[in-house]
Interface confidence: low
């Protein structure tokens, strides 16, 4: 048994540009606290896997309020060591996870708003009883300076805290069951503690945690008699030729007990002795319950308050993780279209749209004509969430900036001659043809294929009639088009102005909430 100790020296912005000025969010003051988590071995474990060697939480640090003009300082830290007691042997190789948490001090209703600011994970080798090890680690834009050590607690001694010793000075000689501690003359040592459940009659150990079998016995706890009938000649556990290995693993082989639990065999099964804080057949249930308030960031804890039931955190929007400790960066999915600015308000996403765009995700292209005037006398026409320019004669393109010859496409049929005009093109038709594009032949009796001409137009003057008809139709169409566009544009702008005012009002209230 022993204690792992961690001393945080400083936490603050790392060197270089882009370092954060403050750990607090825009909501106001905050304070820091730290969580240390120890996992055995050097394997890269998932962040959610249990801290099998133990974990500890620091006190809250002093309240920090950002001074706008002051340089970003090292942040005020909680006092004291973080101590993680370990009950069994110190493994020597371990994973050290240090998390820096921020507690916001705004006016939440149900509980403080916690969020994970930085996490460093380091795999380390460390002997118990050694000096303090110093380290500096970067986590994103933050820098953490700390020292750590592992020390045994008497009667445990040694680099793994597995040798059990008692000072000799108190009793003048070693008490019952104790023998002198080999390298230390003034201490006494207990015989090694064998693996839990090791048979007292048929097993023994020279190192703690092992179970070596006497001749004629086998199995992980030396409880299985060696059969002499079917296994003769096989090399048994005590290197004789009379025993044999029991086929198949014993129930405790591979240790089915999770989270540092120790396994002992029972007839036909096994039993786990769980470390403090874990429960269940295989010690798989964390002893933390809803009664401990384990859900961060306003997560709702669901599960019994009795020690035997696990808990589940239901996270509010914007958070995830088994304890709602991770903020979801929903803006990373770039939900705002057309260059809109994404704002993650925690419970909702908002898009602040660029000029000319609207809608929850800036998906509507307003492209108001005022902002995108059509050049060279072109007329702006809105419709369907987009705009287009109706260009004056001789110009084309999206904004009427490109020169164009309306007669280039030879629009006049049957040899008619094309003339560019301010209101469009006009066709001068060859004899025998009439119409806006000279498309109608005039019949030999002087009557065209068009309906009867109104009074005042002589059928014998088809060219003039065609030109006048074209001009009348074009003028009426332009006037009607302008009226329709003005009305629809007014309606459309009123609708979007109203929506924008409402949306900006909501956003302002939520950002200030």
């Amino acid at each position: 048994a022993g204690v792992f100790e961690l001393q945080i020296h400083s936490f603050g912005p790392g060197p270089g540009p882009g370092a954060p000025r403050s750990p607090c969010s825009a909501r106001g003051p905050c304070r820091l606290f730290f969580r240390v988590c120890l996992k055995p071995g050097l394997s890269e474990e998932a962040a959610e896997s249990p801290c099998a060697l133990g974990a500890a939480l620091s006190a809250r640090g002093p309240v920090y309020t950002e001074q706008p003009e002051a340089p970003a300082p090292d942040l005020p830290l909680p006092n004291g060591l973080l101590q993680v007691p370990f009950r069994d042997a110190w493994p020597g190789t371990f994973s050290l996870i240090i998390e820096t948490w921020r507690e916001e001090l705004g006016d939440q209703i149900g509980g403080p708003a916690w969020s994970l600011l930085a996490r460093v994970t380091r795999r380390r080798r460390l002997a118990a009883g050694g000096p303090w090890a110093r380290d500096i680690q970067r986590a994103g834009a933050w820098e953490l300076r700390f020292s750590y050590r592992a020390r045994c607690e008497l009667p445990a001694v040694g680099t793994a805290c597995t040798r059990l010793c008692r000072p000799r000075s108190a009793p003048s000689r070693c008490g019952p069951g104790l023998r002198p501690c080999a390298p230390l003359e003034d201490e006494c040592e207990a015989p090694p503690v064998c693996r839990a459940g090791c048979s007292l009659e048929h097993g023994f150990c020279e190192q703690p945690g092992e179970c070596r079998c006497l001749e004629g016995w086998t199995g992980p706890l030396c409880m299985v008699p060696v059969s002499t009938s079917s296994c003769l000649g096989l090399r048994g556990p005590s290197s004789t030729t009379t025993g044999c290995l029991v086929p198949g693993p014993g129930p405790c082989d591979g240790n089915p007990c999770a989270n540092g639990g120790s396994c002992s065999e029972t007839p036909g099964s096994f039993e786990c002795t769980c470390p403090r804080g874990f429960y269940g057949l295989r010690c798989e249930v964390s002893g933390v319950t809803c009664a401990d308030g384990p859900c961060f960031n306003g997560g709702l804890c669901v599960g019994g308050a009795d020690p035997d039931s696990a808990y589940i955190c239901h996270c509010p929007p914007g958070f995830q993780g088994s304890n709602c400790e991770k903020r979801v960066d929903r803006c990373s999915l770039q939900p705002c279209r057309n260059g809109g600015l994404c704002l993650d308000l925690g419970h909702a996403l908002r898009c602040r749209c660029r000029a000319g765009f609207a809608g929850p995700r800036c998906e509507h292209d307003l492209d108001d004509c005022a902002g995108r005037a059509c050049a060279n006398g072109g007329t702006c026409v809105e419709g369907g969430g987009a705009h287009r320019c109706s260009c004056a004669l001789g110009f084309g393109g999206r904004n009427c900036r490109e020169r164009a010859d309306p007669c280039a496409a030879r629009p006049c049929a049957h040899g008619g001659r094309c003339y560019a005009h301010f209101s469009g093109l006009v066709c001068a038709c060859a004899p025998g043809y009439m119409g806006a594009r000279c498309e109608f032949p005039v019949h030999p009796d002087g009557v065209s294929a068009l309906p009867a001409a109104p009074p005042g137009l002589r059928p014998g003057d088809p060219q003039r009639a065609g030109v006048i008809a074209v001009i009348v139709v074009v003028v009426i169409a332009i006037v009607a088009g302008i009226v329709v566009l003005v009305i629809s544009r007014k309606k459309r702008m009123a609708k979007y102005e109203k929506a924008e005012i409402k949306e900006m009002g909501e956003m302002h209230r939520e950002l200030n909430a």
Partner: antibody, heavy 117, light 107 residues
Framework: EVKLEESGGGLVQPGGSMKLSCVAS????????MNWVRQSPEKGLEWVAQ??????????HYAESVKGRFTISRDDSKGSVYLQMNNLRTEDTGIHYC????????WGQGTTLTVSS | NIVMTQSPKSMSMSVGERVTLSCKAS??????VSWFQQKPEQSPKLLIY???NRYTGVPDRFTGSGSATDFTLTISSVQAEDLADYHC?????????FGGGTKLEIK
């Protein structure tokens, strides 16, 4: 099992004082913000006061209608929260509940306060 | 303060019928709404949190829905033991506020 148990209600005259108590069991009391919520036929459920944690310097919040008259306090060693009510008015009459949890998931059985002359 | 308005004030239903209770917020409260059941002579109990999440041990005939300003509690097939007052509450902005309640009676 989580239990919240209120006590201290009774009959009091307008202008008088009363202290309500609530003792919690089955939770790590010092980790939870504690609230008082009251209920009357006229006003329904109404949040009254809140006290936060030692790490928050036991910050308190009150409904406008009780500010300056009511004081909420807690004793983590006893797992208890208190509501000291002074200058009581007839509209303070009702069942007073002690509640906690992010969405007020734990409630006591309530204690009845009657303010009447 | 945000005002929560419940309707109807009371309703009488037969066992097996579908019941719909309404709660409207005076402002956008996201999904930060809870529903509480209060049986006669008992304290309120949390039924639904976050507008639509059923709390531990709540039968699945209870369903919450809605967001922003309009919220609904539905009991798909009402049982005799559902006789109670039902309250909605918002936890979006400080202070939290509750609706006036809906009394559900069983015919």
């Amino acid at each position: 099992e989580v239990k919240l148990e209120e006590s201290g209600g009774g009959l009091v005259q307008p202008g008088g004082s009363m202290k309500l108590s609530c003792v919690a069991s089955g939770i790590t009391f010092s980790n939870f913000w504690m609230n008082w919520v009251r209920q009357s036929p006229e006003k329904g459920l109404e949040w009254v006061a809140q006290i936060r944690l030692k790490s928050d310097d036991y910050a308190t919040h009150y409904a406008e209608s009780v500010k300056g008259r009511f004081t909420i306090s807690r004793d983590d060693s006893k797992g208890s929260v208190y509501l000291q009510m002074n200058n009581l008015r007839t509209e303070d009459t009702g069942i007073h509940y002690c509640t906690t949890g992010y969405y007020f998931d734990y409630w006591g059985q309530g204690t009845t306060l009657t303010v009447s002359s | 303060n945000i005002v929560m308005t419940q309707s109807p004030k009371s309703m009488s239903m037969s066992v097996g019928e579908r019941v719909t209770l309404s709660c409207k917020a005076s402002e956008n409260v996201g999904t930060y709404v809870s529903w509480f059941q209060q049986k006669p002579e008992q304290s309120p109990k949390l039924l639904i949190y976050g507008a639509s999440n059923r709390y531990t041990g709540v039968p699945d005939r209870f369903t919450g829905s809605g967001s922003a300003t309009d919220f609904t509690l539905t009991i798909s097939s009402v049982q005799a033991e559902d006789l109670a007052d039902y309250h909605c509450g918002q936890f979006y902005s400080f202070p939290c506020t509750f609706g006036g309640g809906t009394k559900l009676e069983i015919k």
